[in-house]
């Protein structure tokens, strides 16, 4: 049994990264494998992450962590039985992968404005708090044309629209993402998405 | 809004015993380490103990065998233990979250040895 | 154990100048595991800096951290009356544990 493609790990910057790799073969992760974890610290204790299944020879491991400071580095073992297949290490603040938006909603009520609002996926004391900025992807349920992306670079997760920058009487979606300069993250998944029916009154043509 | 509410200090005898109690809020913490740091009057700082997630601890060698930390995730609370109190333990406790460095800090508490 | 040696003890000067604070390693430190903190009378110290030049949140940008290995600085740019206070550098080691410096009081002149 051998390691095909090395485990890659990407952390949200929280409690939980996220580690995959293949092997060189099919692989019952969870019977055959253990990935032992342990961050570099003197009050630190080893873990053990049970792998599942990623795809008939991939793997994939959610450890479970301390909050994230900068600083951290974690030992990885990967073992099959008695046998050390793979060593290695991670340093989670050089692999971030933000967690994704939540409670996205659209408010139509803002005469003729859009005002769409999120949550922020980080409680106050997250280091990433205060450094996300946002990508809106809006788009037509009737017109895969119809797509369009707005970058929220404040802090603030919300973004304002006039309802006339899109089309009247049809249904959009909206669905927000992500990521962080400051550790130059991926960008997080999109968060569900939402629907709803634009309509809003024409102006008056003046003749 | 991280905080961290210590209790617990008084005046002890020489040989006495005493617990520190730190009650925090505003984040997760069972994922954090928490420590001890005491200051003696007029004197600087000095790391007293810590303790990790999974329960891993470490002293100073000046209370080792004296004092036990400890943690109860369910009440965030970290306490400390402090047995055969002598003279120069009188200080003021700082509870503090951290790991390399310490991010938030109790108010304090004044421990009194005297006779 | 690593022993930090802060110099100098007491720093006298004027609100609008600039302090230069020195902390000095019996060993070689990670720049990683350095910190430094502010303490006002009767109060709990305040994280200024760590990982030897990062500003923890909330600090203002006047306050700044260099060095590496055995000689690691605070500097203050421009002295406000809230800045006179007592200032300690701390580190880290896998080993040992956690250590500060003897402090260094930053007083009005």
């Known amino acids: 049994m051998k390691v095909l493609q090395e485990p890659t790990c990407v952390s949200d910057y929280m409690s939980i990264s996220t580690c995959e790799w293949k092997m060189n073969g099919p692989t019952n992760c969870s019977t055959e494998l253990r990935l032992l974890y342990q961050l570099v610290f003197l009050l630190s204790e080893a873990h053990t992450c049970i792998p599942e299944n990623n795809g008939g020879a991939g793997c994939v491991c959610h450890l479970l962590m301390d909050d994230v400071v900068s600083a951290d580095n974690y030992t990885l073992d990967l073992w099959a039985g008695q046998q050390l297949l793979w060593k290695g290490s991670f340093k989670p603040s050089e692999h971030v992968k933000p967690r994704a938006p939540g409670n996205l909603t659209v408010h139509t009520n803002v005469s003729d404005t859009l005002l769409l609002t999120w949550s922020n996926p980080y409680p106050p004391d997250n280091y990433l708090y205060n450094h996300l900025t946002y990508a809106v992807n809006i788009w037509s349920e009737n017109d895969p044309a119809d797509f369009r992306i707005y970058n929220v670079t404040y802090l603030e997760p919300s973004l304002r629209i006039a309802a006339s920058t899109l089309k009247s009487g049809i249904s959009y979606r909206a669905r927000v993402r992500a990521w962080a300069q400051c550790y130059n993250t991926t960008w997080s998944e999109w968060s569900p998405s939402t629907k709803w029916h634009n309509s809003y009154r024409e102006p008056f043509e003046q003749h | 809004e991280v905080q961290l509410v210590q209790s617990g200090g008084g005046l002890v005898h020489p040989g006495g015993s005493l617990r520190l109690s730190c009650a925090g809020s505003?984040?997760?913490?069972?994922?954090?380490?928490m420590f001890w740091v005491r200051q003696a009057p007029g004197k600087g700082l000095e790391w007293v103990s810590g303790?990790?997630?999974?329960?891993?601890?470490n002293y100073a060698d000046s209370v080792k065998g004296r004092f036990t930390i400890s943690r109860d995730n369910a009440k965030n609370s970290l306490y400390l233990q402090m047995n055969s109190l002598r003279a120069e333990d009188m200080a003021v406790y700082y509870c503090a979250r951290g790991r390399y460095y310490f991010d938030y800090w109790g108010q304090g508490t004044l421990v009194t040895v005297s006779s | 154990e690593i022993v930090l040696t802060q110099s100098p003890g007491t720093l006298s000067l004027s609100p609008g100048e600039r302090a230069t604070l020195s902390c000095r390693a019996s060993?070689?430190?990670?720049?990683?595991?350095l910190a430094w903190y502010q303490q006002k009378p009767g109060q709990a110290p305040r994280l200024l800096i760590f990982?030897?030049?990062s500003r923890a949140p909330g600090i203002p940008d006047r306050f700044s951290g260099s060095g590496s290995g055995t000689d690691f600085t605070l500097t203050i740019s421009r002295l406000e009356p809230e800045d006179f206070a007592v200032y300690y550098c701390q580190q880290y080691d896998h080993s040992a544990g956690w250590t500060f410096g003897q402090g260094t009081k930053v007083e009005i002149k």
């Open positions: 060993q070689s430190v990670s720049n990683s595991y």
């Open positions: 990982g030897a030049s």
């Open positions: 303790i990790g997630t999974g329960g891993a601890t």
């Open positions: 505003g984040f997760t913490f069972s994922r954090n380490a």
